[in-house]
Amino acid sequence: IIPVEEENPDFWNRQAAEALGAAKKLQPAQTAAKNLIIFLGDGMGVSTVTAARILKGQKKDKLGPETFLAMDRFPYVALSKTYSVDKHVPDSGATATAYLCGVKGNFQTIGLSAAARFNQCNTTRGNEVISVMNRAKKAGKSVGVVTTTRVQHASPAGAYAHTVNRNWYSDADVPASARQEGCQDIATQLISNMDIDVILGGGRKYMFPMGTPDPEYPDDYSQGGTRLDGKNLVQEWLAKHQGARYVWNRTELLQASLDPSVTHLMGLFEPGDMKYEIHRDSTLDPSLMEMTEAALLLLSRNPRGFFLFVEGGRIDHGHHESRAYRALTETIMFDDAIERAGQLTSEEDTLSLVTADHSHVFSFGGYPLRGSSIFGLAPGKARDRKAYTVLLYGNGPGYVLKDGARPDVTESESGSPEYRQQSAVPLDGETHAGEDVAVFARGPQAHLVHGVQEQTFIAHVMAFAACLEPYTACDLAPRAGTTD
Amino acid sequence: IIPVEEENPDFWNRQAAEALGAAKKLQPAQTAAKNLIIFLGDGMGVSTVTAARILKGQKKDKLGPETFLAMDRFPYVALSKTYSVDKHVPDSGATATAYLCGVKGNFQTIGLSAAARFNQCNTTRGNEVISVMNRAKKAGKSVGVVTTTRVQHASPAGAYAHTVNRNWYSDADVPASARQEGCQDIATQLISNMDIDVILGGGRKYMFPMGTPDPEYPDDYSQGGTRLDGKNLVQEWLAKHQGARYVWNRTELLQASLDPSVTHLMGLFEPGDMKYEIHRDSTLDPSLMEMTEAALLLLSRNPRGFFLFVEGGRIDHGHHESRAYRALTETIMFDDAIERAGQLTSEEDTLSLVTADHSHVFSFGGYPLRGSSIFGLAPGKARDRKAYTVLLYGNGPGYVLKDGARPDVTESESGSPEYRQQSAVPLDGETHAGEDVAVFARGPQAHLVHGVQEQTFIAHVMAFAACLEPYTACDLAPRAGTTD
């Protein structure tokens, strides 16, 4: 498909001249950021960004690649080096420590320097590193965490927790020896390490005692509370704050977000991770966009500003399943949340960053025609005389041999939301990838986001932009009209 | 491997504070660029950049990812959308048209708008688009093309040629019907379309009549001249310029580059593409770094400045073979050329861009330990109880079934320069990938390289920075001390 207007060189020359004009007009703001938002696309490498752009464009009846994601509109871009101290290819725990705390850690640890060792409780104390969210709170800002995973998951936990094992969601997940040594589960740390104004995502079951039925799935024992210590952490959290409210469904969330008496809001919408956007019950569970909007409504009441972490956390899960349909539809919802946040905030006073913690071994090749489905087949056949998809994985659960050969695939099969793209190597879960990821930036001090940087740089840019520790002597003018 | 200094948060905090300090000091230059250099890593997607960084670092006895490529030091980064008008995943012809001429074209066409159709000679005339190199020449600058492929290959051809078929290297490759319609082969266009001061790379055989023995392989008929029109294009080119010199080996190149009487230099060092860096005979063939240095020595004599295209063209070839060793060692040599050029030029007057035309379905996953070989095995075994490499391809010739199963692999096998990494789909040649690629920029107007852009933007930034057509009214101050 060749769009007739694109045949004319004037189309491209005009477009580029406009882009040049916009580039020339870019003026680095010399003011401080009142508000900080970090949008984290878990597993959203550059190949995911491009494929999602095409899909989002095609959902709007365009050919695809010529369209813009919300993140594409951010004026500044950098590349982020994601390795952890001990691994070339990292996990979401060590990376969260990097972009939220500004220090690199070890694989599967969270909020700890690399002096801490995975699963060794006694290496925790003294190695804690403090997140930018924590520093923002100490500076009088309101703070929030929004995710489509459980709120105790690795990425959001980087904002508030310190643990040698990212899998210690509730005390039931922590070995008795570690509990005795004083290591706390992540759910406990969520409510006790610091005062978080808004907590939205999944993860109900880690907050309640074993045997507590889940409100949404009361008859399903596997979805109920998991805690061994008998604590009701939601109750404990509510008791801490006069204006605290706990909600577990969409209706309650929308009500609470508009209620001026609510100062603190915890919304846990699933026992574990939230459902994929394509599986979401839209009456029961809010979308990431709705959670982001609710969080912004509450947080933006604070005249001193806010810090908000928003995670599209299940992009990663779709890729681990080698189900690109899930990964890409999650990316689109993540981008929709970015777009909505842009409408609800001003780039005059809000530094917004979009990045990924790491990539995936996910590729988009095969010379498909423009406008063809991102989930479709490459033109022609492979060496084995069978069709193949343009989307493929290096490794993962999509590897299958059928009668000792690679299975054939049709366009309707590959377009299915359940289809697993093929891989070179069979694994239970497709792995992360180690290449640099993009950082997109907009707002005060966004111009500092440049070149190729360590992932830790992200936390430092946020801290500097808002004049938080250790950059309180930032020498940035407050934005005209900001109140304190 | 955990470096002890990296266990200390101060290591990361200090490093990030330094990076912030450098970012704050960045001052967009308001001057014009006297010189333009575009370094094109053919097929050098972000996954290739990261893997090459690790390999280059490890060759210097470092762990790898913490080190810097020369391109990593460039202060500005953007992402480039590489699709062609007709394909989601492009080739090197359509992309060359984009980044060198500023207009997107169709797959496998070069220097033509998308009104031209692949292989249809009669769609050529009237659809030619003019490269920045051509515009630079018209503005009185010296211009050069350096590549490790044949100089008539798709990428360099984008600087000077207009053809509906990128494979029309010599007239022997052009169908008689197209020749009759007036379509010229690329080699002919190399010497006749415009005056190019420096031409260095491979591609001897396309310049000489059929039956002309090659000087390096005189007994190998397949390496001799291919032309049917009986023309000796080298002779024709030499006759055009008083100070023209033709060389075909390293010794002659080094001599010519230091000879002040040489005004024009053509060096063709292989009949076809140049040899991979790991196969190069260092007495006969120059490296890409040496060719770049020779080009700069000649071009920098012009007080009006120069335009130089430098291509690491065989990164792409290594990937097409699913031989990551070749692709990554080519990338390192490409980066070495960038480094050398940086030493020989000033960022005060030279805008240098580094980018790729497209990516490849090449991934780097599997959670390897820091410091482990980039060509090594992932920890643990796959579902089929066999080892697997951290580097893999989505598709390509590395797909093999042995007795109806995926072959096992050892560390020594995977470390071999001949080893083909496995892929999900068997193809004769691994394909390009469609995700955005990075653009690295340094020098005057480099700050315009920002955000997510169409690949065409690159040509426009170069033209604007040097006040070339259509931006002659660029309103940029010439650098203090520039001469005309």
Epitope: K275, H279, Y325, P397, V400, E418, R420 | -
Partner: antibody, heavy 123, light 106 residues
Framework: EVQLVESGGGLVQPGRSLRLSCTAS????????MSWVRQAPGKGLEWLAL??????????EYSASVKGRFTISRDNSKSILYLQMNSLKTEDTAVYYC??????????????WGQGTLVTVSS | DTQMTQSPSSLSASVGDRVTITCKAS??????IAWFQYKTGKAPKLFIH???TLQPGVPSRFSGSGSGRDYTLTISSLQPEDIATYYC????????FGQGTKLEIK
């Protein structure tokens, strides 16, 4: 409470057509995948057709045995699922169930079933 | 398409016996298997999903296990009310039922 009620079964001659309906209540109909499953006398359960939810564009899938003859569709305004059965054969005689998927552990298991409606194809 | 081979097709056991039914998939189904109990004249009832997760109200004597291509339903101590036909269902790639196992009391 999730409820699925099938209707439209009965006796039909070979070669003729029949449309089954399944009226759904107790959940947001547009958010769920719906399927038809049948059980022929003395035989096992056989999945026939699937229609996905709004988020995935209500795309459809069929088993090889009914592809081209049966069509699954839905009326979202009325929360009704349909199965249009054409060119019926005697071997299509079965109890036809409509079923709703639940997305446990990100799978799409058939968690809720109607009581079924009997279709007899006979001359 | 993924095929499911269920065995045995019928099984006679005594009350209190340990009963095992197996299903083998033609390809890896990534633990996306469910087990249904079917009694004549009633709708099939979901007992286990995602290999081993018991549905609410299902007695704990029922358990599921497996991975890759091989999966098992186990009744640790057979009770009279367990007499029924049991079906496995793969739902990794669309849906495929096993042929069923008819369970009888000796």
């Amino acid at each position: 409470e999730v409820q699925l009620v099938e209707s439209g079964g009965g006796l039909v001659q070979p070669g003729r057509s029949l449309r089954l309906s399944c009226t759904a209540s107790g959940f947001t109909f547009t958010d769920y995948y719906m399927s038809w499953v049948r059980q022929a006398p003395g035989k096992g359960l056989e999945w026939l057709a699937l229609i996905r939810n709004k988020a995935t564009g209500y795309t459809t899938e069929y088993s090889a045995s009914v592809k081209g003859r049966f069509t699954i569709s839905r009326d979202n305004s009325k929360s009704i699922l349909y199965l249009q059965m054409n060119s019926l054969k005697t071997e299509d005689t079965a109890v036809y169930y409509c079923a709703r998927a639940s997305f446990y552990y990100d799978g799409k298991v058939l968690a809720y079933w109607g009581q079924g409606t009997l279709v007899t194809v006979s001359s | 398409d993924t095929q499911m081979t269920q065995s045995p097709s019928s099984l006679s056991a005594s009350v209190g016996d340990r009963v095992t039914i197996t299903c083998k998939a033609s390809q890896d189904i990534n633990k996306y298997i469910a087990w249904f109990q079917y009694k004549t004249g009633k709708a099939p009832k979901l007992f286990i999903h995602y290999t081993s997760t018991l549905q609410p109200g299902v007695p704990s004597r029922f358990s599921g296990s497996g991975s890759g291509r091989d999966y098992t339903l186990t009744i640790s101590s057979l009770q009279p009310e367990d007499i029924a036909t049991y079906y496995c269902l793969q739902y990794d790639n669309l849906y495929t039922f096993g042929q069923g196992t008819k369970l009888e009391i000796k």
